[in-house]
């Protein structure tokens, strides 16, 4: 069984062959970058192999564990503006709302 905060991405009949961090944070745990202009600000989704920056909640048990570089879940572009940024990952910011 996958650890809390993870999901089975590939499974056989009775076991999981590959666990990955659950790729969508619980709505109430999505964290937002601080000191970012609300207007005309974009930021990149986390690179592959990173996980959403979720706080532990009763819904997902604990923060997602790390995963292998072969994680095959990708962020949809339309969701990128609401996606949390892992603190350990480099962040690319572009803002015109200065």
């Amino acid at each position: 069984e996958c650890r809390p905060g993870m999901i089975c991405a590939t499974s056989a009949t009775n076991s999981c062959a590959r666990c990955v961090p659950y790729p969508i944070c619980a709505a109430e745990t999505v964290t937002k970058p601080q000191d970012m202009a609300e207007k005309d600000t974009t930021f990149e989704a986390p690179p592959l192999g990173t996980q959403p920056d979720c706080n532990p909640t009763p819904e997902n048990g604990e923060a997602p564990a790390s995963t292998s570089p072969t994680q095959s879940l990708l962020v949809d572009s339309q969701a990128s503006k609401t996606l949390p940024i892992p603190t350990s990952a480099p962040v690319a910011l572009s803002s015109t709302g200065k």
Epitope: S11, A12, T13, A27, A79
Partner: nanobody
Amino acid sequence: QMQLVESGGGSVQAGETLRLSCTTSAFTFDGPDMAWYRQAPGNECVLVSIISADGRTYYADSVKGRFTISRDNAKNTVFLNLNSLQPEDTAVYYCALDPRKNCRGGYCCANWGPGTQVTVSS
């Protein structure tokens, strides 16, 4: 156990499009995340896509840019648009309820419904 009903599968040629639906009357869809998994004959059950209650979406890299997941909470339905279908997309497609909780233990195909067969020929 909650019963989901998948539909919309069929046999198509490569490059064509299908629209899968997953629905139930037993509960409302506005709470849990929903997911689509698929299983090709003799292969493992593989996560395809997830949609959150508020519409955030995620895709396996094998379908990124070709498949689109959406939901209509008012109609208790989750959709999966399959565009630019390829023979390797041939599988039975299953809808999964609240994968955050229910798809940790392993097998998440055929848990809630019979699935819908998608066959793509070249």
